[in-house]
Interface confidence: medium
Amino acid sequence: ELCDDDPPEIPHATFKAMAYKEGTMLNCECKRGFRRIKSGSLYMLCTGNSSHSSWDNQCQCTSSATRNTTKQVTPQPEEQKERKTTEMQSPMQPVDQASLPGHCREPPPWENEATERIYHFVVGQMVYYQCVQGYRALHRGPAESVCKMTHGKTRWTQPQLICTGEMETSQFPGEEKPQASPEGRPESETSCLVTTTDFQIQTEMAATMETSIFTTEYQ
């Protein structure tokens, strides 16, 4: 089941998926001047069985000016650099993505890939938030959001994170007005079935991430 809305927006924060749940789709987008090969896939799909998950379909781009198809090759270093990447660098990788059952790791780049990747998340996906440069985190709880199915509708849980400017005098989190959950639903709502998968293992993964450092490369 695809998540049919966006993860919550936290002022001065961005978020990242550390691994992608089976069912996640990644658009096959090509950079300017290139297009998908005629019979090429629209998207890559994270699929798997109980022991192994991987991305089905290959994205392939060809020059818009020619009719020839390009072969799937690993980009040269300068081509890889062209793509704006956002990676997690940490002295201690939180969890090897391949070891997270039912999840795929970040797919490798393909030749002439677009500068931006477009993912379509599924129920059970977890994303992790961090404050952007120049802001620091005030935690009231986990800085993550999970896509859940509630009353037959998907929604994202509200991350308990406030990002405050380093120069600002920081208040205790309790003094700040709490942000509303998406669609105004309180997080304590338990009146109906909530479907999430792998929650236990994802929570453990989040715990290991506490000391992780995220860095964003800007061009």
């Epitope: 927006e9 629209l42 931006e116």
Partner: nanobody, 131 residues
């Protein structure tokens, strides 16, 4: 690549309403793009942010000069975005541009407000508000 076509521009009386549409087309999957509106007033070099909406229509962001008069929404097919402005003023006269942005890596914030963050642009539609 995505193509954007604006429509609905023209002349409107001050105090009236304005409704612009932007149709997105191109070989892509589902709701892949956030959409925004910018405007360029006569004699101005910069395109000014008007408002934006996230790819599923969950979030919107409006510029201060118009936020009490503006609604941006997405059509059911998600490939159309609408700008509805009420109580128009002569200073709303401008060329209005529809723009689209993709979601950057697996890291992104949901509504973009700066023109540099937009990857695709329409040709623009002229709106003239006369007093």
């Amino acid at each position: 690549q995505v193509q954007l076509v604006e429509s609905g521009g023209g002349s409107v009386q001050a105090g009236g309403s304005l409704r612009l549409s932007c149709e997105a087309s191109g070989p892509t999957l589902f709701s892949s793009y956030g959409m925004g509106w910018f405007r360029q007033a006569p004699g101005k070099k910069e395109r000014e942010f008007v408002g934006a909406i996230s790819r599923y229509g969950t979030y919107t962001s409006y510029a201060d000069p118009v936020k009490d008069r503006l609604t941006i929404s997405r059509g059911n097919a998600k490939s159309t975005v609408y700008l509805q402005m009420n109580n128009t003023k002569p200073e709303d006269t401008a060329v209005y541009y529809c723009a689209a942005y993709t979601y950057s890596g697996s890291f992104y914030s949901t509504v973009k407000t700066h023109h540099d963050e937009y990857h695709y642009w329409g040709q623009g539609t002229q709106v003239t508000v006369s007093s």
